[in-house]
């Protein structure tokens, strides 16, 4: 399996935005890479977002995705937005080298993202 | 050494308040106990607050202390307030059985407290 590294802990900003780097030890030069972010909480794993990109190009997530990202070599800079306290959990980076063959798969140990809901601002009278 | 247990991670609220339980495996019933909270960051250890209490009585911190607490048996419920993002760090619970002799000392592994500064509220025009 391909090695994937990601930070152990990240704090979301008070605006509910969390960013982290997902780095993979590519055995060669892939031209097509797929990155998927999975969330694990209470032993349930759900897909948060996914993007396939051509090396040297930007990552393109779906328009309604809560993720954005950029790539540089074997590093992917991922940003997840719109997070609430209830979204606190382990976010796992999964990397697949799609082309050329052979196919490689790597799964990181996960980044624990902590999210704190902000206090509401007082009403302006 | 006496065993002291405390949670690995706690998130401060958006108001900068963090609470955690410090539990010590007492060899019996001490009548006088001292609890100290230490903060470790960048290999520097500083004392955050300390209180000596008689079993069955409330913990009394100094008036200007950022800590408050209650005790129940071998558990101390600690609250630290006024925390800012720069206060993020490892908060270590140290428990000393002061009386009767012999003296016992226990130091926990620390609670990583994460603090996120809130976004300022917009000015009301």
């Amino acid at each position: 399996a391909m090695h994937v590294a990601q930070p152990a802990v990240v704090l979301a900003s008070s605006r509910g935005i969390a960013s982290f780097v997902c780095e993979y030890a590519s055995p060669g030069k892939a031209t097509e890479v797929r990155v998927t972010v999975l969330r694990q909480a209470d032993s349930q794993v759900t897909e948060v977002c996914a993007a396939t990109y051509m090396m040297g190009n930007e990552l393109t997530f779906l328009d309604d995705s809560i993720c954005t990202g950029t790539s540089s070599g074997n590093q992917v800079n991922l940003t997840i937005q719109g997070l609430r306290a209830m979204d606190t959990g382990l976010y796992i980076c999964k990397v697949e080298l799609m082309y050329p063959p052979p196919y490689y798969l790597g799964i990181g140990n996960g980044t624990q993202i902590y999210v704190i809901d902000p206090e509401p601002c007082p009403d302006s009278d | 050494a006496m065993h002291v247990a405390q949670p690995a991670v706690v998130l401060a609220s958006s108001r900068g308040i963090a609470s955690f339980v410090c539990e010590y495996a007492s060899p019996g019933k001490a009548t006088e106990v001292r609890v100290t909270v230490l903060r470790q960051a960048d290999s520097q250890v500083t004392e955050v607050c300390a209180a000596t209490y008689m079993m069955g009585n409330e913990l009394t911190f100094l008036d200007d202390s950022i800590c408050t607490g209650t005790s129940s048996g071998n558990q101390v419920n600690l609250t630290i307030q006024g925390l800012r993002a720069m206060d993020t760090g490892l908060y270590i619970c140290k428990v000393e059985l002061m009386y009767p002799p012999p003296y016992y000392l226990g130091i926990g592994n620390g609670t990583q407290i994460y603090v996120i500064d809130p976004e300022p509220c917009p000015d009301s025009d």
């Epitope: - | 060899p27 019996g28 019933k29 009548t31 048996g73 071998n74 009767p100 002799p101 012999p102 003296y103």
Partner: antibody, heavy 118, light 107 residues
Framework: QVQLQESGPGLVKPSQTLSLTCAVS?????????WNWIRQPPGKGLEWIGY???????YYNPSLKSRITISRDTSKNQFSLKLSSVTAVDTAVYYC???????????WGQGTTVTVSS | DIQMTQSPSSLSASVGDRVTITCQAS??????VAWYQQKPGKAPKPLIY???YRYSGVPSRFSGSGSGTDFTFTISSLQPEDIATYFC?????????FGAGTKLELK
């Protein structure tokens, strides 16, 4: 490493006084802890008898209080049990043991058997 | 006095079995409960104190749990050297009291 060692007569006549001593090595009995006597009748459970504290304070099991005295000799680093007016029901293995105040017993002697019989 | 009702009074088990002993206090004793092992002709040895903490040098197969009035002692995988009598003990209130013991035998 603290060590406790009981000594005393193995046979006591009914109505007499049972006397046992516990010699402590490796820790000064006046420095800390509470120094206890516990007994175990043949084939039965454990019964706490009483203690003498590091400060000379005493507390005895109310069920035996009227017949017990626990004293100490700090110069010899030992403490003693006297149980008066014994009967057959006092036949037991007697242990000395150390604890923190109102604590569990972390160190025990090997025990000494006392038989009450005429 | 606080009564410590221990059960069962005797128990037969095989090597590798999970063994559970319970103790019920007649009133709330918090977490001030210890468990001892006693082999014939020997003094009791502390295994667990403060309900769930293993005494120094005690193997991890021994564990304890509970609080208030109900307490459990467990041997996760019985070994031949574990054959002994086990006692619970409350040290919340004087006079300190013990359970009647559980004699553990090999099947």
């Amino acid at each position: 490493q603290v060590q406790l060692q009981e000594s005393g007569p193995g046979l006591v006549k009914p109505s007499q006084t049972l006397s046992l001593t516990c010699a402590v090595s490796g820790y000064s009995i006046s420095s800390g802890y509470y120094w206890n006597w516990i007994r175990q009748p043949p084939g039965k459970g454990l019964e706490w008898i009483g203690y003498i504290g590091y400060d000379g304070s005493n507390y005895y099991n109310p069920s035996l209080k009227s017949r017990i005295t626990i004293s100490r000799d700090t110069s010899k680093n030992q403490f003693s049990l006297k149980l008066s007016s014994v009967t057959a029901v006092d036949t037991a293995v007697y242990y000395c043991a150390r604890n923190y105040y109102s604590g569990y017993f972390d160190s025990w002697g090997q025990g000494t058997t006392v038989t009450v019989s005429s | 006095d606080i009564q410590m009702t221990q059960s069962p009074s005797s128990l037969s088990a095989s090597v590798g079995d999970r063994v559970t002993i319970t103790c019920q206090a007649s009133q709330n004793v918090g977490t001030y409960v210890a468990w001892y092992q006693q082999k014939p002709g020997k003094a009791p040895k502390p295994l667990i104190y403060s309900t769930s903490y293993r005494y120094s040098g005690v193997p991890s197969r021994f564990s304890g749990s509970g609080s208030g009035t109900d307490f459990t002692f467990t041997i996760s995988s019985l070994q031949p050297e574990d054959i002994a009598t086990y006692f619970c003990h409350q040290y919340d209130t004087y006079p300190l009291t013990f359970g009647a013991g559980t004699k553990l035998e090999l099947k």
